[in-house]
Amino acid sequence: AGHLEQPQISSTKTLSKTARLECVVSGITISATSVYWYRERPGEVIQFLVSISYDGTVRKESGIPSGKFEVDRIPETSTSTLTIHNVEKQDIATYYCALWEAQQELGKKIKVFGPGTKLIITDKQLDADVSPKPTIFLPSIAETKLQKAGTYLCLLEKFFPDVIKIHWEEKKSNTILGSQEGNTMKTNDTYMKFSWLTVPEKSLDKEHRCIVRHENNKNGVDQEIIFPPIKTDVITMDPKDN
Amino acid sequence: AIELVPEHQTVPVSIGVPATLRCSMKGEAIGNYYINWYRKTQGNTMTFIYREKDIYGPGFKDNFQGDIDIAKNLAVLKILAPSERDEGSYYCACDTLGMGGEYTDKLIFGKGTRVTVEPRSQPHTKPSVFVMKNGTNVACLVKEFYPKDIRINLVSSKKITEFDPAIVISPSGKYNAVKLGKYEDSNSVTCSVQHDNKTVHSTDFEVKTDSTDHVKPKETENTKQPSKS
């Protein structure tokens, strides 16, 4: 089955510059399929922009200036690139790559989409470091004792742009754990967001990781925030009457 | 030009109560196209749900049902037993891939329908309230309450800043909430919650301990940048 990954969750550009958005295709040979690019502007319908077919033929949507978008395909890295020229405010949108994926049954196809890249246009120069700054909160003793569970909270502050993805994993496991999160909030010129994870008592002695994807992470890799194991056996309790 | 128009911009649904989304086609006969449905969840993930001819995305067949009403020129998507995971924006889209002749393999989308999920009506439940701290940062965790209306107050004489609470549906179908703030005297901050005409304090849940083993790390400690993406 074809799978699409868009490594950039956001791309921030200044006016009239060129933006390049990437889409990595796996599970299918990129030179044996067509890759499509769509955009979703705020409050508008998702619109087809351009496609590159298996034989390299490029098709551009007729209602859009032909020089605005360019599409490329690099078989060696199994990547398709959408180039957006001369970026302007009207180009603020989420850009999705997509492909038709054949189902097991002959003749049945579905179009699958990548996770999208949000193009952000800014006219201000921000501080050098606008990556998310983490603060960790460990479970309160009261919660672990009374509820036989513990909540970890991962606070991320002073980041720009506002596009951020947070998920949680247990150490030595690639399973994404069910977490909850607040809305992204504006604080002066930057943003903050928090996410929390509640785990049962039996998991409190394991290390947990809050994994953060952001455009301005150092070296362009996901930031991993380590939550150490919690010792619950050393606590005696005498809860007040409820 | 062909246009796909959703019946509603927003559809509130209750957990477990079936819901129906409709999308009408303007300017063309719906029978000349294949209809698709997608869901966009938080973080912009666009997931395929259904395509005409009984094709469902992984994990959707049991809880979703797609249909076409040729007479009314509209597409229908039923969510048979909604859960909190079904919250998101739902899009209908059409194409003519494989119909022969001058086919188009691009999708034409309609505007999204925002589906908001609410817990089903249930007996009122009082929240548990816990405080978590790190440096000047304080978080008030409010767990497992119903109904949704709640006021969370972090009590301090030296407030730096406070943020609006996040209120979400818990896995058990009630509500959870977190309110964050920064305070100069974070050690003395407590949390009081007004819910269902009652007040619940974090101090009601405090425990006595003989240990300092359960410690908090310093701010921004335990952060690493791995080599893998």
Epitope: S62, S66, E70, V71, D72, H85, E88 | -
Partner: antibody, heavy 118, light 112 residues
């Protein structure tokens, strides 16, 4: 400064092919489209097509499809236009010209004269 | 394909007088998203490549005298030379760059 330097004049027999080069300097070659426009003596300007050197993608005027091939060599910032099956009505000055994205053509080469005669 | 039609084919104007050249496109070259008309005007003198005068239908290229102005929107456009100078004798072309590129038929401007 921006320069587009084209190869010299060519005289060709009908049925032959001609390949004209266009060397770019003073700008980022891979970020601009290179267009080819021709002009027969006393006639107007006719857009033949364009290449995007960043990807090698080509877009041809329907009239020349099958007869024209546009290529590029990014290592030497040079674009090429080859026109095959030449006939007398292909006698013209051939210009390369650049444009950025959805901006218009803003800079032209000096032109290459191609004469097709038996 | 978008077809560009210019009128008149040729024009003779006295020095210091106004010259007006018209251009019509077979379909709109106005992109509603940015409200820009993808239309340019060029001047070409014998033995030289064309020179860009106006883009976005009305924006003068730097270094172009302000006697040159462009107007119009959608499908109908005009190039105006407010006070003709001897060095303005040339052929003028309109060009759409909304869908690739197409040039107009050209207008030869001479001194009366």
């Amino acid at each position: 400064q921006v320069q587009l330097v084209q190869s010299g004049a060519e005289v060709k027999k009908p049925g032959a092919s001609v390949k004209v080069s266009c060397k770019a300097s003073g700008f980022t070659f891979t970020d601009h489209y290179i267009n080819w426009v021709r002009q027969a003596t006393g006639q107007g300007l006719e857009w033949m097509g364009q290449i995007y050197p960043g990807s090698g993608n080509t877009y041809y005027n329907q009239k020349f499809k099958g007869r024209v091939t546009m290529t590029r060599d990014t290592s030497i910032s040079t674009a090429y236009m080859e026109l095959s099956s030449l006939r007398s009505e292909d006698t013209a000055v051939y210009y390369c010209a650049r444009n950025y994205g959805d901006y218009t053509i803003d800079f032209w080469g000096q032109g290459t004269s191609v004469t097709v005669s038996s | 394909d978008i077809v560009m039609t210019q009128s008149p084919d040729s024009l003779a104007v006295s020095l210091g007088e106004r010259a007006t050249i018209n251009c019509k496109s077979s379909q709109s070259v106005l992109y509603s998203s940015n409200n820009k008309n993808y239309l340019a005007w060029y001047q070409q003198k014998p033995g030289q490549p064309p020179k860009l005068l106006i883009y976005w239908a009305s924006t003068r290229e730097s270094g172009v005298p302000d006697r040159f102005s462009g107007s119009g929107s959608g499908t109908d456009f005009t190039l105006t030379i407010s006070s003709l100078q001897a060095e303005d004798v040339a052929v003028y072309y309109c060009q759409q760059y909304y869908r690739y590129h197409t040039f107009g038929t050209g207008t030869k401007l001479e001194i009366k």
